[in-house]
Structures are given as structure tokens and as C-alpha cells.
């Protein structure tokens, strides 16, 4: 067990803070909840503290909860591949570019680390080149979320990992909005971290609303489990 893994043996409180700017529409989101890595379970509630969110909530799920992949359940035979926990408590920087097919892109930078007993994910998001009447700024996404696989590979040069996955957002007209994610994680501290063999995280997310909440918000329940060493993933990164 890595030193960082010992911090995740029970339920851990989570705080998420995001400052965003998409096509000049500025907003802030605050989230609170808890994670239980034993089950790979996350329960979080997010509130837009600046009024109405200018983008659909589902487009931010990966930035919020896929940001705290340290709560993923790694089975016993895969614990030596868990970079995320091994970087704790000092944490990691997580940077992403998210390309929305036929639309704009998000760039995000987050620091994920322990502050006291709380796991904190502080994020800055910048979105550009979005169509004002497109699926994102036009709020045409359904309020739901599909299951996905998140592909992880070691980045030995940067003592971290590279990650790729493609999200399928359901559109109200029955079509799909694709969002291709490119992610890089690097440790904040200088202690040893686990550099994994290639594998993936299997994610399942459910979005809901709090009937007593008047503000624009999202309630998220998520389960994430690490799974098989996938074939072929090393070819590009030899």
C-alpha cells in the first residue's frame, strides 16, 4: 500500500471549487460531498454561485468528479497502478483539453490535494470557440450521463500519467455530442509516485436534482472502478 493510499481507507469529505469563463460568460461553481474509495463511490452536490450556469451541467462532470480519480476503486491486483492515491496528500496537477465535436473546447487546470482531512479540487476552466446556438451554449444536452472508459498510461518523462477518453453527451433531438478529452497529471510533491501499466477506469454516473434547492445545481452519484490492462496502448508511447 502506498503512503497516499492509507488516506482513502474510509469516507473522505470532498470540496470542489471552479472558476470558469466560456466565450466570455464567467461563472463559479462550488461543490461538496464525500468519496469512498473502498467502493469507488462519489456523492457530490454542485451549486452555481453566480446564478444560472451558462453551459449544460453534464459538460462539467468530467472536470468535477473525473477530477478526483483518487476515489476510483483499484482491485487488490491493480493497486500498484494507482497513481492518483500515491500522489497524496500533496496531490497532483490535472490539466485537460476537451474538444467538443463541431464546436469549441474547454481547457482546464486543477490542483487536487488534501487540505486538512478534506480532498480539495480547485479548478480553472477556459472555454473558447463555442457556437452561441450550438449544443453547449444553446443548452441542448439532456440532463443525464453515459458510462465511459477512461484510458490511462504512464508518462515517465513527467513522472505522471496521460489520459484519454471520449464522452458521449445525449442531445435532446436524439443525437450525440462527442467530447474528446486529453489529460495530463503530474505530482505536486517530490515524493515517489506509482507509474502505472496501461489500464482503464470504468465509470458510471447518475445526475439528479435536489427538490429543495432553489439555485442552479447538480447532484452527482458516481462509481469508478479500475479494470483490465488493455492491449495496444503502449504502442504510441514507447
Amino acid at each position: 500500500m502506498s503512503k497516499g493510499e492509507e488516506l482513502f481507507t474510509g469516507v473522505v469529505p470532498i470540496l470542489v471549487e471552479l472558476d470558469g469563463d466560456v466565450n466570455g460568460h464567467k461563472f463559479s461553481v462550488s461543490g461538496e460531498g464525500e468519496g469512498d474509495a473502498t467502493y469507488g463511490k462519489l456523492t457530490l452536490k454542485f451549486i452555481c454561485t453566480t446564478g444560472k450556469l451558462p453551459v449544460p451541467w453534464p459538460t462539467l462532470v468530467t472536470t468535477f468528479s473525473y477530477g478526483v480519480q483518487c476515489f476510483s476503486r483499484y482491485p487488490d491486483h491493480m493497486k500498484q497502478h494507482d497513481f492518483f492515491k500515491s500522489a497524496m496528500p500533496e496531490g497532483y496537477v490535472q490539466e485537460r483539453t476537451i474538444f467538443f465535436k463541431d464546436d469549441g473546447n474547454y481547457k482546464t487546470r486543477a490542483e487536487v490535494k488534501f487540505e486538512g482531512d478534506t480532498l480539495v479540487n480547485r479548478i480553472e476552466l477556459k472555454g473558447i470557440d463555442f457556437k452561441e446556438d450550438g449544443n453547449i451554449l444553446g443548452h441542448k444536452l439532456e440532463y443525464n450521463y453515459n458510462s465511459h472508459n477512461v484510458y490511462i498510461m504512464a508518462d515517465k518523462q513527467k513522472n505522471g500519467i496521460k489520459v484519454n477518453f471520449k464522452i458521449r453527451h445525449n442531445i435532446e433531438d436524439g443525437s450525440v455530442q462527442l467530447a474528446d478529452h486529453y489529460q495530463q497529471n503530474t505530482p505536486i510533491g517530490d515524493g515517489p509516485v506509482l507509474l502505472p501499466d496501461n489500464h482503464y477506469l470504468s465509470t458510471q454516473s447518475a445526475l439528479s436534482k435536489d427538490p429543495n434547492e432553489k439555485r442552479d445545481h447538480m447532484v452527482l452519484l458516481e462509481f469508478v472502478t479500475a479494470a483490465g490492462i488493455t492491449h495496444g496502448m503502449d504502442e504510441l508511447y514507447k
Epitope: 472508459n149 484519454n164 474528446d180 495496444g232 504510441l236
Partner: nanobody, 130 residues
Framework: QVQLVESGGGLVQAGGSLRLSCVTS????????IGWFRQAPGKEREGVSS????????YYADSVKGRFTISSDNAKNTVYLQMNNLKPEDTAVYYC???????????????????????WGQGTQVTVSS
Amino acid sequence: QVQLVESGGGLVQAGGSLRLSCVTSGFTFDDYAIGWFRQAPGKEREGVSSISSSDGTTYYADSVKGRFTISSDNAKNTVYLQMNNLKPEDTAVYYCAADWAAWPSIRVGVGVPAYEYDYWGQGTQVTVSS
């Protein structure tokens, strides 16, 4: 609209060769990884090979390495699968599929499974007799 049309399948004896073609239309070729998959009766669809036409990155399943070669002709928006030294266990319907990505080469390097692909052709039958 998006179309992928496979051709080149047929009946061949073990040790023989076939060249499959996948002609694509309706999308920007360079924005996609193109993959070949196959499905034998009663079995799951499995990945065979894939290519990023933008930079030539390729992926091969272990079972076909050294025997199959994938290539693309960007001017014709076409991907080819040259299959040599065919074996009876290569018998299957072969499908061509397209996977949109901002950087297709990374998707190819990942060797993503069938359900990650966005568009599919109708398939072409390959039968290898012993």
C-alpha cells in the same frame, strides 16, 4: 451522410491472401481513426487493426501481427487491410469503423474497443478453408 463501404472479402484457402478496402465518405478523413474489426459466428466482435490517416500511427491485435497490414490512401478516403498467410480462424465478417477524435493517433495508440467507434460499415465476409 457518413458512409463506410467494405469490399474485397471472399473465399480463400489457408495460406492465401486477401485485400479488404473501406471507402469512406461524409466526414473529414483526417479527423478519424479507422479500424477493422471482425466477428465470427457465435463470438464477440474483436479489433483487428486501426490507423490514423493524419500521421500513419497503426495498431494490430496480437493475433494478426506480422500477417496483416493496414494502410490508407488519403486522396481516396480509403483504408486497406492486406491479409496474408490467412488461417481458418481468420474466418469472420470484417467490418470497417470510424472513431472521431481530436488527435486520432492517440485513439489508435490506445487500441480502443469496438463500442468506442462512432460509425460502422455493413461488413464483408472472409472465409478461409483448410
